[in-house]
């Protein structure tokens, strides 16, 4: 579970080492802080768990793209 | 695609152990979050546990806790279902099951193993 | 824990009738954000692990007969057999998959009149 060491900023320190099925995934975002450990994906559920997941596996990069495709807004 | 075999049928006595399992191919076992499901004769399907992604760990039904333990070997891509304390009234077929990353529900099933706790 | 409940617990149609399903949640298994049910439906028939029909409680899997449809949004769903056949005689499950715990309807059992 992602950790807010010093309000408003929100590290990972452990990924989920299990892949996620993109239909439980509500949204996403980065944490890029330089006063993180390392760079990470925390995705939110549809039932609004928090999940760390590290943006270099395929999966989560999927789900990113997916959720991406999601929400954009249809062409008029 | 995933395919899942199970183990074969097991005759127990009442206060006995059976530990069932489950060999996962077409996928690892790390790719998937196995669950198992369990029917008792002329019954309905009853989830009996398996493992929640969101939670990072595995989670059992509240009538289970206690007596059922699901573990996995990641080597066999092997998923295993231990019931302790057998009684008569655990007689059924017992199924492992599995979703897609892309669905999120059941669409996998083992073929199921029948336990028979007799005396 | 979401609880499941169909109704009726068994039905006899005639062949080619319609037989009707019931399903209903204990709360809403609708996520508005992705416009999605989580709810699926299986056919089980005796000695055979459950096979899935209906997904996000209206989609059909592939192979499924057009005969099987699922209708139905929040906390009420409608599994339809618009014309029974002989090889439809099987017990139906309704399941949720919105939270954990995973919760299965009691069956419907269905059978030729």
């Known amino acids: 579970q992602p950790d807010a060491i010093n309000a408003p900023v929100t590290c990972c320190y452990n990924f989920t080492n299990r892949k996620i099925s993109v239909q439980r995934l509500a949204s996403y975002r980065r944490i890029t802080s330089s006063k993180c450990p390392k760079e990470a994906v925390i995705f939110k559920t549809i039932v609004a768990k928090e999940i760390c997941a590290d943006p270099k596996q395929k999966w989560v990069q999927d789900s990113m793209d997916h959720l991406d495709k999601q929400t954009q807004t249809p062409k008029t | 695609q995933v395919q899942l075999v199970q183990s074969g049928a097991e005759v127990k006595k009442p206060g006995a152990s059976v530990k069932v399992s489950c060999k996962v191919s077409?996928?690892?076992?790390?790719?998937?979050?196995m669950h198992w499901v369990r029917q008792a004769p002329g019954k309905g399907l009853e989830w009996m546990g398996g493992?929640?992604?969101?939670?990072?760990?595995?989670i059992y039904a509240q009538k289970f806790q206690g007596r059922v333990t699901m573990t996995e070997d990641t080597s066999t891509d092997t998923a295993y279902m231990e019931l302790s304390s057998l009684r008569t009234e655990d007689t059924a077929v017992y199924y492992c099951?599995?979703?897609?990353?892309?669905?999120?529900?059941?669409?996998?099933w083992g073929q199921g193993t029948l336990v028979t706790v007799s005396s | 824990d979401i609880v499941m409940t169909q109704s009726p617990d068994s039905l006899a149609v005639s062949l080619g009738e319609r037989a009707t399903i019931n399903c209903k949640s204990s709360?809403?298994?609708?996520?508005?954000?992705?416009?999605?049910?989580?709810l699926v439906w299986y056919q089980q028939k005796p000695g055979q692990p459950p096979k899935l029909l209906i997904n996000?409680?209206?989609t059909r899997e592939s192979g499924v007969p057009d005969r099987f449809s699922g209708s139905g949004s929040g906390t009420d769903f409608t599994l339809t057999i618009s014309s029974l056949q002989a090889e439809d005689v099987a017990v139906y499950y309704c399941?949720?998959?919105?939270?954990?715990?995973?919760?299965f309807g009691q069956g419907t059992k269905v059978e030729i009149k």
């Open positions: 399941q949720q998959y919105y939270s954990s715990p995973w919760t």
């Open positions: 996000w409680a209206s």
């Open positions: 493992f929640d992604p969101e939670d990072g760990e595995t």
């Open positions: 077409g996928y690892t076992l790390t790719e998937l979050s």
């Open positions: 099951t599995t979703d897609d990353f892309w669905s999120g529900y059941f669409d996998y």
């Open positions: 709360q809403s298994l609708l996520y508005s954000s992705k416009n999605k049910n989580y």
